[in-house]
Interface confidence: low
C-alpha cells in the first residue's frame, strides 16, 4: 500500500527510538570513517524532518523516497572527497544509481583502530553520565566496522548491551558481572555479522534464486510440519527482509521483519510447535528467538521421496510446467526429512537432481535415464561426512590451538598469495569449527560444521575480493556458492608459488609479547607460522612443529627473564639462525 510520505510511514511504524537507531546504523555503514558527532548531527536532522512529515505528510520533500532523503543528507558531508576519495563521485549520480554506488563502496575491512575495552569503572561512569550517547556509540562503532550487520538484530544486541551495564554497574563485583557478558556479546556479534555477510553475498553475487533456495532448505529443516505453501510464503517474506537490509533499506527491513515475526506467531499452529516461548517475548527478542529456534520434530511416516520424484511417470511433465516450483518441492521434501544434512549439501543434491532432469527429460526414455538419480547422491553425502569425521578426530587429538595451526599450514600452502592477517583470521575461525561442532552427536555435526564453514569461507571471499591476489581463491569463491567448501578442500599445494624472501624482521620479537593476552600471543605465533610456510612451502609438519616448539620455549624463557628485552634480542637471533638451519632457509 502506497503512503504519501515513506519517511512518515516508517517513523510511525518503528517509533522514534528505533527510527533514530536505524538511521544511525545506516549512515555509519555507508560512511564508515565519519566521526560519531557528525553522524549524530545528521541523524538528528533527519529525525526532525521526519517529525514534520508525521505532522503533515504533504509538507515539502516529504514525498521523496528514503534513498533520496538519506543520500542527499550523506552528500552534505563536507569532507566527503578528502575522506572517501572516489566515493564522493556517487553524489553526482541520481537515484537509484547513487545508492548502488554507496553500496559498492562499503568496506568489509575498514582501516579503523581496534576497539579497546576501557576499565569497567570508566565504562560504568560513561554509561551513567549519558546512557543515550553511550548506547548510540555502541551502535556506531559496531555498524561502521560491520557494514552488513543485520540492523534489526543490532538493535537486539544494543538492548542486551544496555541490560548488561544496567545490571552490572550496580553489582558488588562489576567486572566479574560485566566482562563475561561483554565477551559473550562480542563473540555472538562477530558470528552474527559473518552469518549476515553470507546472506548478503548470496543475494548480491548469486541472485535472489540462490538465496531463496537456501531459505527453502533451511526453513524446511526447521519447520518440517509446515506445508510447502507455508514454507514458500515464509521464504518470499524472508527474502524481502534480507534484500532490504543488504541493500541499505534498514527502516523497511526492520519494519518487514517485525511483520514477519507477527505473522509467524499468529500462524504458529501451522508452522512449528517450537515457537510458543519465542512468541511470548517482546519484539526484538521474539525475532531473534524465531531466527534461532530449534528444528521441530519431523512428521511421522513421511512417504518415500522416490515415489514423486523418480518413480512417477509425471516427473518430466511436472518439471516442465513449473521448473522452480517443482525443484522447490523437491528441496522442501528432502530437507524436511534430513535435519542431519547441511543446507549446502541439500542444495548440491537439488542441483544434481536439476541437472539430471535437464538432461533426461530431453532423452528418448526419460524414466530410464533418471531412474538411478538418487544413487548419484551417495558420494555427495559421504564426502562431507568423511571430511568432518577426519577433522573432528584431528581436533580431538590436537585441541583448538594446534588444530588451528594445522589449518593455517594447510591453507597457507593452498593459497600462499593471500595476506598473512587474512590467513590467520580465516584459519583461526575455520579451526573454531572443532569446539563448535565436534561435541555434537553425528546427526547434528554436518549441519553445524559445513554451514559454519560456508560462513567462514565467505569471509575469505569478501576480504579477497577487495584486493584479489589469487586466481584459485577467485575461482572457488565465484564459480558456485554451494561448492565453495569442496572447492577449497580440493586445492592442493600451489606449486606455482615462488617462496617469499626471508626477512629476519618478520621473526623479531620484543618484550611486549609478554603482556599480551593468551589470544593475542597465539595470534603472534600463528602469524609467524604463516610467514614460515610462505618462506618454506615445502617444509614438513615435523620441521614446522620443531620450529614452533622452539619459538614457544623462547617466548616463555624470555618472558621469565629479568632483562626481557635483552633476552629477546640475543635469544631471538639464535632462534632465527636455528630455524633457518632447521628449514634449510
Amino acid at each position: 500500500d502506497a503512503h504519501k510520505s515513506e519517511v512518515a510511514h516508517r517513523f510511525k511504524d518503528l517509533g522514534e527510538e528505533n527510527f533514530k537507531a536505524l538511521v544511525l546504523i545506516a549512515f555509519a555503514q555507508y560512511l564508515q570513517q565519519c566521526p560519531f558527532e557528525d553522524h549524530v548531527k545528521l541523524v538528528n536532522e533527519v529525525t526532525e524532518f521526519a517529525k514534520t512529515c508525521v505532522a503533515d505528510e504533504s509538507a515539502e520533500n516529504c514525498d521523496k523516497s528514503l534513498h533520496t532523503l538519506f543520500g542527499d543528507k550523506l552528500c552534505t558531508v563536507a569532507t566527503l572527497r578528502e575522506t572517501y576519495g572516489e566515493m564522493a563521485d556517487c553524489c553526482a549520480k541520481q537515484e537509484p544509481e547513487r545508492n548502488e554506488c554507496f553500496l559498492q563502496h562499503k568496506d568489509d575491512n575498514p582501516n579503523l583502530p581496534r576497539l579497546v575495552r576501557p576499565e569497567v569503572d570508566v565504562m560504568c561512569t560513561a554509561f551513567h553520565d549519558n546512557e543515550e550517547t553511550f548506547l548510540k556509540k555502541y551502535l556506531y562503532e559496531i555498524a561502521r566496522r560491520h557494514p552488513y550487520f543485520y540492523a534489526p538484530e543490532l538493535l537486539f544486541f544494543a538492548k542486551r548491551y544496555k541490560a548488561a551495564f544496567t545490571e552490572c554497574c550496580q553489582a558488588a563485583d562489576k567486572a566479574a558481572c560485566l566482562l563475561p557478558k561483554l565477551d559473550e556479546l562480542r563473540d555472538e556479534g562477530k558470528a552474527s555479522s559473518a552469518k549476515q555477510r553470507l546472506k548478503c553475498a548470496s543475494l548480491q553475487k548469486f541472485g535472489e534464486r540462490a538465496f531463496k533456495a537456501w531459505a527453502v532448505a533451511r526453513l524446511s529443516q526447521r519447520f518440517p510440519k509446515a506445508e510447502f505453501a507455508e514454507v514458500s510464503k515464509l521464504v518470499t517474506d524472508l527474502t524481502k527482509v534480507h534484500t532490504e537490509c543488504c541493500h541499505g533499506d534498514l527502516l523497511e527491513c526492520a519494519d518487514d521483519r517485525a511483520d514477519l515475526a507477527k505473522y509467524i506467531c499468529e500462524n504458529q499452529d501451522s508452522i512449528s510447535s517450537k515457537l510458543k516461548e519465542c512468541c511470548e517475548k517482546p519484539l526484538l527478542e521474539k525475532s531473534h528467538c524465531i531466527a534461532e529456534v530449534e528444528n521441530d520434530e519431523m512428521p511421522a511416516d513421511l512417504p518415500s521421496l522416490a515415489a514423486d520424484f523418480v518413480e512417477s511417470k509425471d516427473v518430466c511433465k511436472n518439471y516442465a510446467e513449473a521448473k522452480d516450483v517443482f525443484l522447490g518441492m523437491f528441496l522442501y521434501e528432502y530437507a524436511r526429512r534430513h535435519p542431519d544434512y547441511s543446507v549446502v549439501l541439500l542444495l548440491r543434491l537439488a542441483k544434481t537432481y536439476e541437472t539430471t532432469l535437464e538432461k533426461c527429460c530431453a532423452a528418448a526414455d526419460p524414466h530410464e535415464c533418471y531412474a538411478k538419480v538418487f544413487d548419484e547422491f551417495k558420494p555427495l553425502v559421504e564426502e562431507p561426512q568423511n571430511l568432518i569425521k577426519q577433522n573432528c578426530e584431528l581436533f580431538e587429538q590436537l585441541g583448538e590451538y594446534k588444530f588451528q595451526n594445522a589449518l593455517l599450514v594447510r591453507y597457507t600452502k593452498k593459497v600462499p598469495q593471500v595476506s598473512t592477517p587474512t590467513l590467520v583470521e580465516v584459519s583461526r575461525n575455520l579451526g573454531k569449527v572443532g569446539s563448535k561442532c565436534c561435541k555434537h552427536p553425528e546427526a547434528k555435526r554436518m549441519p553445524c560444521a559445513e554451514d559454519y564453514l560456508s560462513v567462514v569461507l565467505n569471509q575469505l571471499c569478501v576480504l579477497h575480493e577487495k584486493t584479489p591476489v589469487s586466481d584459485r581463491v577467485t575461482k572457488c569463491c565465484t564459480e558456485s556458492l554451494v561448492n565453495r567448501r569442496p572447492c577449497f578442500s580440493a586445492l592442493e599445494v600451489d606449486e606455482t608459488y615462488v617462496p617469499k624472501e626471508f626477512n629476519a624482521e618478520t621473526f623479531t620479537f620484543h618484550a611486549d609479547i609478554c603482556t599480551l593476552s593468551e589470544k593475542e600471543r597465539q595470534i603472534k605465533k600463528q602469524t609467524a607460522l604463516v610467514e614460515l610456510v610462505k618462506h618454506k612451502p615445502k617444509a614438513t609438519k615435523e620441521q614446522l612443529k620443531a620450529v614452533m616448539d622452539d619459538f614457544a620455549a623462547f617466548v616463555e624463557k624470555c618472558c621469565k627473564a629479568d632483562d626481557k628485552e635483552t633476552c629477546f634480542a640475543e635469544e631471538g637471533k639464535k632462534l632465527v639462525a636455528a630455524s633457518q638451519a632447521a628449514l634449510g632457509l
Epitope: 563475561p180 565477551d183 559473550e184 581436533f395 580431538e396 585441541g399 583448538e400 572443532g434 569446539s435 565436534c438 561435541k439 593468551e518
Partner: nanobody
Framework: EVQLVESGGGLVQPGGSLRLSCAAS????????MSWVRQAPGKGPEWVSA????????RYAESIKGRFTISRDNAKKTLYLQMNSLKPEDTAVYYC????????GSQGTQVTVSS
C-alpha cells in the same frame, strides 16, 4: 550429547568446607573454559568463578574471593570448586557451565550453610 553432572553438595555449618565436582562428557573438555554459577532461592543465577581450558587462568566473584578455589583435571574431565569458610549467604544450588555463561544446562548440587 553434552552432559555436566555436579556432586559434592550438602549441609554444612558456617565456617565449614565442601568440595564440589563436575563430571563432563560429550565434548572436548580440555578445549573449553569452564565456570561455576550458583542460584540462591528466589534469586537469579550468579556467576561464581571461571577457569581457562589449560587451568592456568582463574577468576572469582568478589563475594567469594580468598575462600573458594576453582581447579580442573582435564585427564579426568572434571571441574572442581573447593569451598572454605562457608557462610549462610553461600547457600544455593551450584551449577557448572561451559565457558562463562550463566545459563544452566544441568541439575546442579545443593549447598546449604546453616547452624
Amino acid at each position: 550429547e553434552v552432559q555436566l553432572v555436579e556432586s559434592g553438595g550438602g549441609l554444612v555449618q558456617p565456617g565449614g568446607s565442601l568440595r564440589l565436582s563436575c563430571a563432563a562428557s560429550g565434548f572436548t573438555f580440555g578445549s573449553f573454559g569452564m565456570s561455576w554459577v550458583r542460584q540462591a532461592p528466589g534469586k537469579g543465577p550468579e556467576w561464581v568463578s571461571a577457569i581457562d581450558s589449560g587451568g592456568t587462568d582463574t577468576r572469582y566473584a568478589e563475594s567469594i574471593k580468598g575462600r573458594f578455589t576453582i581447579s580442573r583435571d582435564n585427564a579426568k574431565k572434571t571441574l572442581y570448586l573447593q569451598m572454605n569458610s562457608l557462610k549462610p549467604e553461600d547457600t544455593a544450588v551450584y551449577y557448572c557451565t561451559i565457558g562463562q555463561s550463566t545459563s544452566r544446562g544441568s541439575q546442579g548440587t545443593q549447598v546449604t550453610v546453616s547452624s
